[in-house]
């Protein structure tokens, strides 16, 4: 897996931002803004929530999600799982790449208390051309979107 | 926004560290150590808390702040906002780039006395020459400084 | 400390993952998987928990650890310290590079409550050839390992 960084080539990078349409409630991955505001794609493409690799190599991939709620009502998961997952044509299921579990709801000591928490993930993974990376949050009802600065997803080749 | 990485050029990077003078209490951004210990500037400059871009491009910018306190009295901020903000000559106000909100004080149970929390932000943004990036924390009274390893601010071109 | 990125050279990078053998209980640093699954070494080597630098330069180093427990048993530290430390032949003691302190146990409001928390660290440091970077967690008994996706350690040259 020798990888060279050519001086005349653009280094692939992307930063995608949270938007009102990010949370589908369908059980699928989060969706992202790719063009407006701070969002961009350079040497990577996007499809249905996924960053799609066009050039094989090692990538630092990252995501942050803003979590929040009022109190801790029954029925809401006490554990939040936030992860980056790979989809590859060579394997039928998504593969976990980087995952965090948090119990932010436990911070609220009374039923009316507003709480906030943030989960950040980042790490280097090898990705082949055509492979896709997505973000999932379970329970996504606790993800708080606003203006693209609090929940986001990105990558760059290293 | 095609960006080339020339093989003969130094890749801009910086890592600034927290110091006793970081917290001004003035409502301004946090200030940073730029030379001593782990701190350095390479192809970026510094002014009044800001990393100043000399070469336009995409940068991975990051910051971590160490939060801590004793007990959780009413009157101390229940929500902490930690963010990276851009100042540009083309716009009069700071622009939010990456932001987190946390409720760390809720971690202190009725008996647990001292609480600690950490907030990490990182992401890729496009910055033009002359633009500046700063770190803000509200309520900054809860930021815990020690030796530059717990609260810091950095960037590198990708 | 002028550093050039040669176009014909492979850029050093590594991502090491948590494994059943990571937690030694010996007071030493965490140990890591270097080959299986998502783990790899490219232009860096590994020895006894340490990433070993072969080429001097500025590196973005990072680590995430997954913390978790059931309630907050007596005898467990209420403060968790997660850090990246440098070992250099020029100095007898480890040097703190990036450190976080958290009080995750305070999130559990009842003695039987399961809680999860995650700690992420990342930042740019200068490393000389032969220097080593390790990860330490105190109290490591609260680190939760599973499949290499929740606790990890990596670096790449910037």
């Amino acid at each position: 897996l020798i990888q060279e960084r050519r001086s005349h080539e653009v280094n692939p990078a992307a930063h995608l931002t949270g938007a009102n349409s990010s949370l589908t409630g369908s059980g699928g991955p989060l969706l992202w803004e790719t063009q407006l505001g701070l969002a961009f794609l350079r040497g990577l493409s996007y499809h249905d929530g996924a960053l799609v690799v066009t050039k094989a190599g090692y990538y630092y991939i990252y995501s942050k999600v803003q979590l929040g709620g009022v109190g801790c009502p029954l029925g809401l998961a006490s554990t939040i799982t936030h992860g980056l997952y790979k989809r590859t044509p060579r394997y039928p299921e998504e593969l976990e790449l980087l995952v965090s579990q948090q119990s932010p709801c436990g911070r609220a000591t009374s039923s009316s208390r507003v709480w906030w928490d943030s989960s950040f993930l980042g790490g280097v993974v090898h990705l082949e051309a055509g492979e896709k990376v997505v973000v999932r949050v379970l329970d996504e009802r606790l993800v708080r979107l606003r203006d693209g600065t609090r929940s986001y997803f990105g990558a760059f080749m290293v | 926004l095609i960006q080339e990485r020339r093989s003969h050029e130094v890749n801009p990077a910086a890592h600034l560290t927290g110091a006793n003078s970081s917290l001004t209490g003035s409502g301004g951004p946090l200030l940073w150590e730029t030379q001593l210990g782990l701190a350095f500037l390479r192809g970026l400059s510094y002014h009044d808390g800001a990393l100043v871009v000399t070469k336009a491009g995409y940068y991975y910018i990051y910051s971590k702040v160490q939060l801590g306190g004793v007990g959780c009295p009413l009157g101390l901020a229940s929500t902490i906002t930690h963010g990276l903000y851009k100042r540009t000559p083309r716009y009069p106000e700071e622009l939010e780039l990456l932001v987190s909100q946390q409720s760390p004080c809720g971690r202190a149970t009725s008996s647990s006395r001292v609480w600690w929390d950490s907030s990490f932000l990182g992401g890729v943004v496009h910055l033009e020459a002359g633009e500046k990036v700063v770190v803000r924390v509200l309520d900054e009274r809860l930021v815990r400084l020690r030796d530059g390893t717990r609260s810091y601010f950095g960037a590198f071109m990708v | 400390l002028i550093q050039e990125r040669r176009s014909h050279e492979v850029n050093p990078a590594a991502h090491l993952t948590g494994a059943n053998s990571s937690l030694t209980g010996s007071g030493g640093p965490l140990l890591w998987e270097t080959q299986l699954g998502l783990a790899f070494l490219r232009g860096l080597s590994y020895h006894d928990g340490a990433l070993v630098v072969t080429k001097a330069g500025y590196y973005y180093i990072y680590s995430k650890v997954q913390l978790g427990g059931v309630g907050c048993p007596l005898g467990l530290a209420s403060t968790i310290t997660h850090g990246l430390y440098k070992r250099t032949p020029r100095y007898p003691e480890e040097l703190e590079l990036l450190v976080s302190q958290q009080s995750p146990c305070g999130r559990a409001t009842s003695s039987s409550r399961v809680w999860w928390d995650s700690s992420f660290l990342g930042g740019v440091v200068h490393l000389e050839a032969g220097e080593k970077v390790v990860v330490r967690v105190l109290d490591e008994r609260l680190v939760r390992l599973r499949d290499g996706t929740r606790s990890y350690f990596g670096a790449f040259m910037v």
């Epitope: - | 801590g68 306190g69 004793v70 007990g71 959780c72 009295p73 009413l74 009157g75 101390l76 009725s110 008996s111 647990s112 006395r113 001292v114 600690w116 309520d139 009274r141 809860l142 815990r144 | 007596l74 005898g75 467990l76 530290a77 209420s78 403060t79 109290d139």
Partner: antibody
Framework: QVQLQESGPGLVKPSGTLSLTCAVS?????????WNWVRQPPGKGLEWIGE???????NCNPSLKSRVTISVDKSKNQFSLKMNSVTAADTAVYYC???????????????WGQGTTVTVSS | DIQMTQSPSSLSASVGDRVSITCQAS??????LNWYQQKPGKAPKLLIY???NLETGVPSRFSGSGSGTDFTFTISSLQPEDIATYYC?????????FGGGTKVEIK
């Protein structure tokens, strides 16, 4: 430099209420510090009673909680202790003391009043 | 409540001697421990905070060490003015609790 001064009756009848006030001078009670009460029975060690923050948030020793009320008066820059249903076992020197800052992470009791002796007797 | 066990309860030493007092917590309290000096008829005085940090203005012959459950307070060279009772105090958990005290006397 902050100074603390306790005041209140030196003698309280059994089953009565002990009332003490601590005046803060040289600084504001509205700082981020916690303000504490500690007592010391004759010839014995120190016992923490409780604390208050300027916003009114309080914490008390569970062994005394049902009998103790701590309050703050920001306009007078003082805080107070009330303990009801006292017995001879509550005879002690009572100290007011400044604790660590809520916006801080150490909790040394760094400023103390000179103490006031309260005797519970009929 | 966290129990703080101090030993010895009293000691007698000569001027110039090195004196050590230990404090053991009933559970891990990290470094959340303070040491106080109380002279007869006076209020306690904070000497050491966070297990090992010297309060401003306190002579350097006083020191503290330890973490977790076991802590030590040391006077490197006992002076006549050091005659007092010394207390440890934890603040890892509420209620704040003190050790039983160690009375230091001059031989």
């Amino acid at each position: 430099q902050v100074q603390l001064q306790e005041s209140g009756p030196g003698l309280v009848k059994p089953s009565g209420t002990l009332s003490l006030t601590c005046a803060v001078s040289g600084g504001s009670i509205s700082s981020t510090h916690w303000w504490n009460w500690v007592r010391q029975p004759p010839g014995k060690g120190l016992e923490w009673i409780g604390e208050i923050y300027h916003s009114g948030s309080t914490n008390c020793n569970p062994s005394l909680k049902s009998r103790v009320t701590i309050s703050v008066d920001k306009s007078k820059n003082q805080f107070s202790l009330k303990m009801n249903s006292v017995t001879a076992a509550d005879t002690a020197v009572y100290y007011c003391t400044r604790g660590g800052a809520a916006a801080g992470t150490n909790y040394g009791l760094d400023v103390w009043g000179q103490g006031t002796t309260v005797t519970v007797s009929s | 409540d966290i129990q703080m066990t101090q030993s010895p309860s009293s000691l007698s030493a000569s001027v110039g001697d090195r004196v050590s007092i230990t404090c053991q917590a009933s559970q891990d309290i990290s470094n959340y421990l303070n040491w106080y000096q109380q002279k007869p008829g006076k209020a306690p005085k904070l000497l050491i905070y966070d297990a090992s940090n010297l309060e401003t203005g306190v002579p350097s012959r006083f020191s503290g060490s330890g973490s977790g459950t076991d802590f030590t307070f040391t006077i490197s060279s006992l002076q006549p003015e050091d005659i007092a009772t010394y207390y440890c105090q934890q603040y890892d958990n509420l209620p704040l609790t003190f050790g039983g005290g160690t009375k230091v006397e001059i031989k």
